[in-house]
């Protein structure tokens, strides 16, 4: 791997549990300065691979609030606006950390998570497998 | 929102902070145990909007490795094998959040932060905006 | 047309196996994860067994694990349920369908098979 070198400045790690447990500052700096606004808040509906956006919140982990994708159909929509099922709607999967309230219900300690959250949907050319 | 009673076996928050700093466990707890390894992996290709992937490294975040979809193209692939203009491919962007070493070069102390990443792509009709 | 039809269902004893069949037609199951449910009388439908696409990896129900083995045969198109050391609690109606933490459900239940466990 890359190795750092340290800045003279750092907090104190003399923590027994260091490396694994640090300091973070929960006042998030967003960098996305350059974006739409909008995203891709319309996409969902007028994609031929068309999802629903469902809420999951939990209280014990932050952020508490995610927006779970699902795919509307199993087949995509065709040009005519019905459903073809030559076609899969897939889900677009991606693992993204959250932070874990641990013990539960502290306010000031956590611990990383990896879930895996459906972001969209996206049409694919389906897989045959043909009998032997 | 949502009170959450305070667990007496936290950890002590007297840090002057505090709530703005938190400890964080960075030993991952992974809850992906149902999913699926392959998951969108061969997507990417089979999609009629294809993507790319690239590396975004940085060792300055955690994690250091992002992989950002880019689409091959403005259009989508039709039943031909073609590229059809009259469809758009469009990037699938998720906000996520990683940990950003604050100060710089520290191995235990973190800053959350926000960024936007394309995770995939999907194929939409355009808007199409007619002249007065 | 969509439809997934269930089989292998019956009155079986306490301690007995069963194995239930999904046949999936109208589309191509090898994208999909596939999950089996079930609902007993004046109960709501439980997840009980998902095996991702590609039989990548299976996940149970904390109350059927050990017993019961789900599989997927994309071939045939068709999905299954080994169910070992049957309990009168798996007494319901059982029902194949995408997995539906990724997909809207609704549309693909099919009439599901019958499982009755009694002495």
């Known amino acids: 791997g890359i190795t750092i070198p340290r800045n003279p400045g750092c907090p104190n790690s003399e923590d027994k549990n260091f490396p694994r447990t640090v300091m973070v500052n929960l006042n998030i700096h967003n960098r996305n300065t350059n974006t739409n606004p909008k995203r891709s808040s319309d996409y969902y509906n007028r994609s031929t691979s068309p999802w629903n956006l469902h809420r999951n919140e939990d209280p014990e982990r932050y952020p508490s609030v995610i927006w779970e994708a699902k795919c509307r159909h199993l087949g995509c929509i065709n040009a005519d606006g019905n459903v073809d099922y030559h076609m899969n709607s897939v889900p677009i999967q991606q693992e993204i950390l959250v932070l874990r309230r641990e013990p539960p219900h502290c306010p000031n300690s956590f611990r990383l998570e990896k879930i895996l959250v459906s972001v969209g949907c996206t049409c694919v050319t389906p897989i045959v497998h043909h009998v032997a | 929102g949502i009170t959450i009673p305070r667990n007496p076996g936290c950890p002590n928050s007297e840090d002057k902070n505090f709530p703005r700093t938190v400890m964080v466990n960075l030993n991952i707890h992974n809850r992906n145990t149902n999913t699926n390894p392959k998951r969108s992996s061969d997507y990417y290709n089979r999609s009629t909007s294809p993507w790319n992937l690239h590396r975004n490294e940085d060792p300055e975040r955690y994690p250091s490795v992002i992989w950002e979809a880019k689409c091959r193209h403005l259009g989508c692939i039709n039943a031909d094998g073609n590229v059809d203009y009259h469809m758009n491919s469009v990037p699938i962007q998720q906000e996520i959040l990683v940990l950003r070493r604050e100060p710089p070069h520290c191995p235990n102390s973190f800053r959350l932060e926000k960024i936007l990443v394309s995770v995939g792509c999907t194929c939409v009709t355009p808007i199409v905006h007619h002249v007065a | 047309q969509v439809q997934l039809v269930e089989s292998g269902g019956g009155l079986v004893q306490p301690g007995g196996s069963l194995r239930l069949s999904c046949a999936a037609s109208g589309f191509i199951i090898s994208d999909f994860p596939m999950s089996w449910y079930r609902q007993a009388p004046g109960k709501e439908r439980e997840l009980v067994a998902t095996i991702t696409s590609a039989g990548g990896s299976t996940n149970y129900a904390d109350s059927v694990k050990g017993r019961f083995t789900i599989s997927r045969d994309d071939a045939k198109n068709t999905v299954y349920l080994q169910m070992n050391s049957l309990k009168p609690e798996d007494t319901a109606v059982y029902y194949c369908?995408?997995?539906?933490?990724?997909?809207?459900?609704?549309?693909?239940w099919g009439q599901g098979t019958q499982v009755t466990v009694s002495s």
């Open positions: 369908n995408v997995d539906w933490k990724w997909y809207e459900v609704d549309d693909y």
